[in-house]
């Protein structure tokens, strides 16, 4: 699979669309998940409605909203205030029970507003922090909330 | 096979300037921030600098904020540092690194280039 | 800045043995840190990241362990490769901050 470069810029929003087979995929759940390492596990961030038919609602988990059109084969991940912590690889992903089919492999860039002080110390603070699905989010005085990563795929 | 070679290390004087380059081959340079991270002789590991995949942003180390700049030529491959204002503090081991997805880790290093800032 | 603080600084063991070497951050890192090992003149090489994800090519003997503010490096039985500097670092979150060092010594 090829991987799709995305760009955003801090603070604002960013639309990643995973299309896919509509009749091959059908009745399969998606999800988003962030790849920890070339070869290694993939973290869930979220996945749509846990009732296939309503896959269409969004469903959010701390800054990171998913929705899938199943009849176009479109699925939707927004990823609201993009702060540079976010900036990574991930995968869409189609479920079929515990195994997971990536759709599509996507980089996130994170960009800051060069007219904001170049100052790396006042780059990392969010407003809103995302958190990982099945992850703790730990607060601290750094730049990102730390978000710990469970080593599972 | 990731491969990442430094070039441009040497002896300067103090207050003077030394352009660093890194050659990266094995993988989509592209699609990968790379940073630079230092070593003193016979002292750990201090990071330096990193950017982003298309070199749209850069971070820094305090240490170096305001006197190092780091760059990239995507088309070349190849990732860059221009030190200025030298101070023998910067003396050290400049090793060139390929940071995982924008994650703060380095999975391939470069061998080292050795900068000696003395007058 | 966090920092992260590394002990023993420096430790004699045998082939065979088995060895921990602790990581301590000044606040919370959740399970963000990565470990190196570097051998004398050479570049690091990166084992462990996210506390427990092998690298690529790590063999099993080496594991990694904690969160929050205390990690353990274990190497199960030491091979004779194994003797080299270890450095803990904090990733995830600018700046990425090393531990001193370990240096592992044979006994």
């Known amino acids: 699979l090829n991987t799709t470069v995305l760009q955003g810029m801090a603070g604002q929003s960013l639309r990643v669309s995973c299309t896919y087979d509509a009749l091959k995929h059908w009745g399969r759940r998606k999800a988003w998940c962030r790849q920890l390492g070339e070869e290694g596990p993939c973290q869930r961030v979220v996945s749509t409605h846990g009732v296939w038919l309503l896959a269409f609602l969004k469903k959010r988990n701390g800054s990171t909203v998913i929705a899938d059109d199943t009849l176009a084969g479109t699925v939707t991940i927004t990823l609201k205030n993009l702060q540079a912590g976010d900036a990574g690889l991930y995968q869409c992903q189609s479920l079929r029970g515990r195994e997971a089919e990536v759709l599509q492999k996507v980089l996130v860039e994170v960009l800051e507003d060069p007219l904001d002080d170049q100052d790396a110390g006042d780059l990392w603070v969010p407003e809103e922090s995302s958190s990982f699905e099945g992850a703790q989010v730990e607060h601290s005085t750094s730049r990102n909330q730390e978000t710990s990563f469970p080593p599972t795929s | 096979e990731v491969q990442l070679l430094e070039s441009g290390g040497g002896l300067v004087q103090p207050g003077g300037s030394l352009r660093l380059s890194c050659a990266a081959s094995g993988f989509t340079f592209s699609n990968y921030y790379m940073a630079w991270v230092r070593q003193a002789p016979g002292k750990g590991l201090e990071w330096v600098s990193s950017l982003t995949n298309s070199g749209g942003s850069t971070y820094y180390a305090d240490s170096v904020k305001g006197r190092f700049t780091i760059s990239r030529d995507n088309s070349k491959n190849t990732l860059y540092l221009q030190m200025n204002s030298l101070r023998a503090e910067d003396t050290a081991v400049y090793y060139c690194?390929?940071?995982?997805?924008?994650?703060?880790?380095?999975?391939?290093w470069g061998q080292g280039t050795l900068v000696t800032v003395s007058s | 800045d966090i920092q992260m603080t590394q002990s023993p600084s420096s430790l004699s063991a045998s082939v065979g043995d088995r060895v921990t070497i602790t990581c301590k951050a000044s606040?919370?890192?959740?399970?963000?840190l990565a470990w190196y090992q570097q051998k004398p003149g050479k570049a690091p090489k990166l084992l462990i990241y996210?506390?427990?994800n092998r690298f690529t090519g790590v063999p099993s003997r080496f594991s990694g362990s904690g969160s929050g503010t205390d990690f353990t490096l274990t190497i199960s039985s030491l091979q004779p490769e194994d003797f080299a500097t270890y450095y803990c670092q904090r990733i995830y979150n600018s700046p990425w901050t090393f531990g001193q060092g370990t240096k592992l010594e044979i006994k």
């Open positions: 606040q919370n890192v959740g399970n963000n």
């Open positions: 996210y506390t427990s």
């Open positions: 690194t390929r940071e995982w997805a924008g994650s703060g880790y380095f999975d391939y």
